[in-house]
């Protein structure tokens, strides 16, 4: 019951990062304009990764997309890259997870099986979670950077009679979504990978061998012994995964040729 | 047609306060913010604030924040600013206008003549 | 606040010839996130309200003539109308649509020679 809930809360902890990770990449407010000095203004410009915006007090906001690809700075073609790659790899992680889910039965899936596929889309998570805090992150290193340059700008750039104002921008919201975002999907991950343990057959139920000792007549039944899959738990501990009684669907067959590669 | 249609002329004492209404009609009322100018006799324009009809969030020019209140009546579609504590030197045509692209103001009523006069 | 200067401060023109207003701003009203300048340019008749020729200091209002034009970028601007008419005798202003509050030139007198 345990490793069911683990698995599905990873799966839905996965599921609202990848949400969130595709929401904050489709997102204009990656960058937006500091305010500090001027809390009300009459032209607000805001930034994402694919189009700034400028939203007038009229009420009126204009988008131009950046209709260039080698014009733009290597930083957001990196940017745009990472999160990209989270998620494809987050998309391909839910889909893997789906048929892992424990709670779901295709044909006659085994246990092992299923466990691989927990472990594989949990990884995946992992990576797509860390793709979108670095991408989130190596983009807010830029703002950083820029606000700190535009700031010295402004001040030396006050020589003559007339001021220019330089526009600076901050961190926008769409930021702090991919953080959190990509913070989710790691921990999704990483619950999918804990699941993973669990979900691993229990014991290889191996037919008693009568192996016949000379003068003695005592019979050896070698049950102790398990298939190791690295992610194994001691017999006596089998109830802490399976919750006790089991249904019907959920008898582990008799081990294969197959089992175990 | 846009058109705004603004209350008529008003005398009133110093000290006392003014409510000037704009009618709006020919467009979609909250879609477009409405602002408000005033022109001293013989003088050039100034800026008094902006209102939205949609969620009733103001911008004012910090000369008058403390006199000026503008609100809105969307059941009406109608504009209301109100100028407290008068002076003589409020005596002015006071414009109700449209809030367009650019920041512009592309429709103005008619004006509201505003005499402040012991 | 941002101060409008217009000049001259009235001009005499011929029916049919060039007229040329200036507008100066003392900070500049160029936006840097779509490169447009927030000036807008108004026309006022004799007891009536303006009335909105430019904005973003060369976009023509539908309905406005096209001899009537607009130039210029972060402090200084230009109201060109290219032959003058009649009914173009006005008092011409300009205004800041970039930051609060949203300031005035004094206005420019346009006169028939």
């Known amino acids: 019951m345990a490793v069911t809930a683990c698995q599905g809360l990873g799966f839905v902890v996965s599921l609202i990062g990848i949400a969130g990770i595709i929401a904050a990449t489709c997102m204009d407010q990656w960058s937006t304009q500091d305010l500090y000095n001027n809390p009300v203004t009459a032209v607000f410009n805001y930034q994402g990764l694919w189009r700034s915006c400028v939203r007038e007090s009229s009420g009126f906001t204009e988008c131009r997309g950046y209709f260039t690809l080698l014009g733009l700075p290597a930083m957001l073609q990196a940017v745009r890259a990472l999160m990209i790659v989270g998620i494809v790899l987050g998309a391909i992680g839910l889909l893997v997870s789906i048929f892992a889910l424990k709670c779901i039965r295709i044909g006659s899936m085994e246990d092992s099986a299923k466990a691989n596929m927990t472990l594989t889309s949990g990884i995946m998570f992992i990576v797509s979670g860390l793709c979108a805090i670095a991408g989130v992150s190596v983009f807010a290193n830029m703002l950083v950077t820029n606000f700190w340059m535009s700031t010295a700008n402004m001040y030396t750039g006050m020589g003559g009679m007339v001021q220019t104002v330089q526009t600076r921008y901050t961190f926008g919201a769409a930021l702090f979504v991919g953080w959190v975002a990509g913070g989710l999907t790691l921990i999704g991950g990483v619950m999918m990978c804990i699941a993973c343990r669990g979900l691993a057959p229990e014991e290889t139920n191996y037919k008693a061998v009568s192996y016949h000792a000379s003068g003695h007549s005592v019979a050896y039944k070698p049950g102790g012994f398990k298939a190791s899959t690295g992610f194994g738990s001691n017999t006596k501990n089998k109830k802490i995964y399976d919750g006790g009684a089991r249904t019907e669907d959920e008898v582990q067959s008799y081990p294969s040729k197959h089992d175990y590669v | 047609e846009v058109q705004l249609v603004q209350s008529g002329a008003e005398v009133k004492k110093p000290g006392a306060s003014v409510k000037v209404s704009c009618k709006a009609s020919?467009?979609?009322?909250?879609?477009?913010?409405v602002g408000w100018v005033r022109q001293a006799p013989g003088q050039g324009l100034e800026w008094i604030g902006n209102?939205?009809?949609?969620?009733?969030?103001?911008n004012y020019n910090q000369k008058f924040k403390d006199r000026a209140t503008l609100t809105v009546d969307k059941s009406t579609s109608t504009a209301y600013m109100e100028l407290s504590s008068l002076r003589s030197e409020d005596t002015a045509v006071y414009y109700c206008?449209?809030?367009?692209?650019?920041?512009?103001?592309?429709?103005w009523g008619q004006g509201t003549l505003v005499t402040v006069s012991s | 606040d941002i101060v409008m200067t217009q000049s001259p401060d009235s001009l005499s023109v011929s029916l049919g010839e060039r007229a040329t207003i200036n507008c100066k701003s003392s900070?500049?009203?160029?936006?840097?996130?779509?490169?447009?300048?927030?000036l807008t340019w108004y026309q006022q008749k004799p007891g009536q309200p303006p009335k909105l020729l430019i904005y973003?200091?060369?976009t023509k209002q539908s309905g406005v003539p096209d001899r009537f034009s607009g130039s210029g970028s972060g402090t200084d601007f230009t109201l060109t109308i290219s032959s003058l008419q009649a009914e173009d005798v006005a008092v011409y202003y300009c205004?800041?649509?970039?930051?609060?509050?949203?300031?005035f030139g004094q206005g420019t007198k346009v006169e028939i020679k």
């Open positions: 206008t449209r809030l367009s692209s650019g920041n512009s103001f592309d429709y």
């Open positions: 020919g467009y979609t009322f909250t879609s477009f913010w």
């Open positions: 209102v939205s009809p949609s969620d009733s969030y103001t």
């Open positions: 900070q500049s009203v160029l936006n840097s996130g779509n490169q447009k300048n927030y």
């Open positions: 973003w200091s060369s």
């Open positions: 205004q800041n649509a970039f930051s609060f509050p949203f300031t």
